[in-house]
């Protein structure tokens, strides 16, 4: 018996087609992805093959103005339209709190939403009961397939699930649910979840009875053969893990942003054992036409977005200096504003010992593309912020050793004075440079804001200590020459859309007046 698994993950609000780098589509003939194009391909496969499941491994939420405006209603609407069979909860599904998950998505989705390792307690338990499930058994042709869900147990540090959801260890939580499916004589079981490729592989190895793992969170690109676009494969598709009980378990992910549709064909014997698995992600490029009915629906929903982008979010009573002349040479108040917003967006009081789990931000000055003039009645709009942060990136959470941070700050000024983009703006950090010293030895003082303290203060950076830092995904991926961050980071969790972070902060503060306050100094 043959099953075709179509899968997406980390779509992050890319409902419309995008450029090759998943930013806003500029030249339509070269654009990719989007739900209208995805639907065309899915329907084509559904017509051609008998047993097809369309699955999503979480993080539909967060990433573009679509989510900012529609807050998840767009996810439910278009996933329903595409007739998804199941979805696992990702960490970003909790970005607007539990209510922001329940109302727009859990109550509106016409497909099961899954996670076996999230347990509700207190008053939330009855409110959310039945709205998400540990697993679902789906009839496919004349057979049944069990789908069991899981979500990163780091979600409380990455999003806003509140205090009434407990995120358990994935493997511990999955095993009894898979065992339950076995008692129901379900002998074909897919683990669908959002904990990253390393955990996906562990689940394949450790959870008895799981036949296939469909993952997300780490934006992992797997491919067999010559890859069709810019993404470099982390391994073959599917990635085969040998389980502790000796089975070959295929593990897949499909990069991110709806650029690819994962396509996996699995052959099962009559006892539900995987005999063979093969496939590849399908690049959703312009050779695949956009479905006209879905496209028309997208255009209808778009109208509200255009209106939103010109509405006032808040006011500034000072000039927001985002000029290259400032942000690539010295501390600029636009950099301070953005870093303050980044830290504010990551306030998670999850431990009495810590006032917060992260206190530091770094931001490449070259990523700040425009100032905002306060003389336009002080008004700040989404449109203004899109000029400041036009690349559609995310502000991510990483863990780095102090020694890596020191290298990053040396890189920040290694060729100072040439208006290059790697000059770092900061938050929760005090840095002093001596430009008379040779490159690689110009950081003379680097103090960082403590987190394990009741009164935050600045202490010297310790080389061997592990620190959490918020930074643009561009830097986490080694951009602007920050190869040391990419090579040495100990953990990387994708965060929220950059503009969304800043716009939320401005809306919250209502009136802003960021200053230049001595975060970056030259001796």
């Amino acid at each position: 018996w043959e099953l075709t698994i179509l899968h997406t993950n980390d779509v992050h609000s890319r409902l419309e087609q995008t450029s090759e780098d998943s930013s806003k589509c500029v030249n339509a003939s070269r654009c990719m992805g989007g739900v209208a194009r995805l639907f065309t391909k899915v329907q084509q496969i559904r017509r051609a093959e008998p047993n097809v499941l369309l699955l999503d491994a979480g993080d539909q939420y967060q990433g573009t103005i679509w989510f900012t405006v529609y807050k998840g209603a767009e996810v439910a609407h278009f996933m329903n339209a595409l007739r998804y069979d199941a979805m696992a909860l990702g960490n970003h599904e909790f970005d607007n709190g539990v209510e922001g998950l329940i109302e727009p998505l859990l109550k509106e989705a016409k497909f099961p939403i899954l996670s076996a390792n999230i347990k509700a307690k207190g008053p939330l338990a009855s409110q959310i009961s039945g709205l998400y499930l540990p697993y679902k058994v789906l009839p496919v042709g004349d057979e049944v397939v069990g789908i069991v869900g899981y979500t990163s147990k780091e979600t409380p540090f990455l999003s806003n699930p509140g205090t009434n959801l407990v995120f358990e260890d994935e493997i511990t939580a999955l095993q009894p649910e898979v065992d339950k499916l076995k008692t129901l004589n379900v002998n074909k079981i897919i683990a669908l979840g959002h904990s990253g490729f390393e955990m996906d592989k562990l689940i394949a190895q450790k959870v008895r009875g799981v036949d296939v793992v469909v993952g997300g969170h780490s934006n992992t690109f797997l491919y067999t053969g010559n890859p069709p676009s810019k993404e470099v494969p982390a391994g073959k598709y599917p990635f085969i893990v040998t389980s502790d009980d000796g089975r070959k378990v295929p593990v897949v992910q499909a990069y991110a942003f709806g650029k690819y549709l994962g396509y996996l064909k699995i052959e099962f014997d009559e006892r539900g054992n995987v005999i063979s698995s093969h496939g590849n992600p399908i690049l959703l490029n312009s050779s695949i036409p956009e479905d006209p009915s879905i496209k028309a629906d997208i255009n209808k929903w778009r109208i509200k977005l255009d209106n939103y982008s010109t509405q006032e979010l808040g006011k500034t009573i000072v000039y927001l200096d985002g000029s290259s002349q400032s942000c690539r040479f010295r501390e600029c108040n636009m950099g301070n504003l953005i870093c303050d917003a980044m830290i504010n967006n990551n306030l998670r009081h999850t431990d009495e010992m810590f006032w917060n789990h992260v206190s530091m931000c770094i931001l490449n000055g070259g990523g700040i593309r425009s100032p905002i003039d306060e003389r336009n009645n002080g008004t700040i709009t989404w449109e203004n912020l899109a000029a400041v942060l036009p690349f559609g990136g995310t502000f991510d959470l990483v863990q780095l050793k102090g020694s890596t941070l020191k290298k990053a700050f040396e890189h920040s000024v290694h060729r100072y004075g040439q208006s290059t983009g790697e000059f770092l703006q900061v938050g929760g950090i005090h840095v002093v440079y001596d430009l008379s010293r040779k490159p690689g030895d110009r950081v003379v003082k680097l103090d960082v804001l403590c987190t394990k303290c009741r009164v935050p203060s600045y202490d010297p950076l310790k080389m061997d200590e592990v620190y959490k830092v918020i930074l643009p995904n561009f830097l986490a991926n080694g951009g602007d020459g920050f190869q040391m961050i990419k090579d040495e980071l100990l953990r990387h969790d994708s965060g929220d859309q950059d503009i969304n972070v800043v716009s939320t902060y401005i809306s919250k503060m209502k009136v802003i007046y960021p200053a230049v306050e001595g975060r970056i100094k030259f001796s």
Epitope: A125, S126, S129, G130, L133, Y135, K136, V137, P139, D142, E143, V144, G146, P176, E177, K180, L181, T183, L184, N185, V186
Partner: antibody
Framework: QVQLVQSGAEVKKPGASVKVSCKAS????????MHWVRQAPGQGLEWMGA????????SYAQKFQGRVTMTRDTSTSTVYMELSSLRSEDTAVYYC????????????WGQGTLVTVSS | DIQMTQSPSSLSASVGDRVTITCKAS??????LAWYQQKPGKAPKLLLS???SLETGVPSRFSGSGSGTDYTLTISSLQPEDFATYYC?????????FGGGTKVEIK
């Protein structure tokens, strides 16, 4: 709306067989399990087994293994439960009840069929 | 098989009383517990599933709680139409098993 309509009461002699039917309407017949639960006079509820009409898969309670047969006819959206080698302690009301494949609580029940086993 | 022990087997109460029925499983059932109400000559009616999930149309005076092996059905203010027999059922492990029932009678 969902309805489960069962066949009428039966009186059988010990050693005989009985076949009870349950006709479903108001939902997609092939995507839910149909369970059989019986209740002896003045007693509690006892699960006998279930059939998944989508593929005909059956699970029986050990106690009834070998004596009970469950079948389905998808063209008429009907399931059947046949119990053989009847004895007096099989006198009971037999209910069909719908349940999810994966979460087997019973959200809709038939009206019940009284089977009396008496010589 | 998982044994479901329900207590009490019967109770007398008055209209307006708060009534609690307990159900103990012989092993953990991971919150896969349902409660049913049955009136004489009628089929059982599902009240709650997943311990706490109230079925559509079931009055909010019915509520469920518990975890692990111990579960409770509570009727906050007994109404005349609530006099019936109540059954718990586990659906964690085949064979699905029911408690022995609790008959709620008028005092």
């Amino acid at each position: 709306q969902v309805q489960l309509v069962q066949s009428g009461a039966e009186v059988k002699k010990p050693g005989a067989s009985v076949k009870v039917s349950c006709k479903a309407s108001g939902y997609t017949f092939t995507t839910y399990n149909m369970h059989w639960v019986r209740q002896a006079p003045g007693q509690g509820l006892e699960w006998m087994g279930a059939i998944f009409p989508g593929n005909g898969h059956i699970s029986y309670a050990q106690k009834f293994q070998g004596r009970v047969t469950m079948t389905r006819d998808t063209s008429t959206s009907t399931v059947y439960m046949e119990l053989s080698s009847l004895r007096s302690e099989d006198t009971a009301v037999y209910y069909c009840a719908r349940g999810d494949y994966d979460e087997s609580y019973f959200d809709y029940w038939g009206q019940g069929t009284l089977v009396t086993v008496s010589s | 098989d998982i044994q479901m022990t329900q207590s009490p087997s019967s109770l007398s109460a008055s209209v307006g009383d708060r009534v609690t029925i307990t159900c103990k499983a012989s092993e953990g059932i991971y919150n896969r517990l349902a409660w049913y109400q049955q009136k004489p000559g009628k089929a059982p009616k599902l009240l709650l599933s997943g311990v706490i999930s109230l079925e559509t149309g079931v009055p909010s005076r019915f509520s469920g709680s518990g975890s692990g092996t111990d579960y409770t059905l509570t009727i906050s203010s007994l109404q005349p139409e609530d006099f019936a027999t109540y059954y718990c059922q586990q659906y964690w492990s085949i064979p699905w098993t029911f408690g022995g029932g609790t008959k709620v009678e008028i005092k």
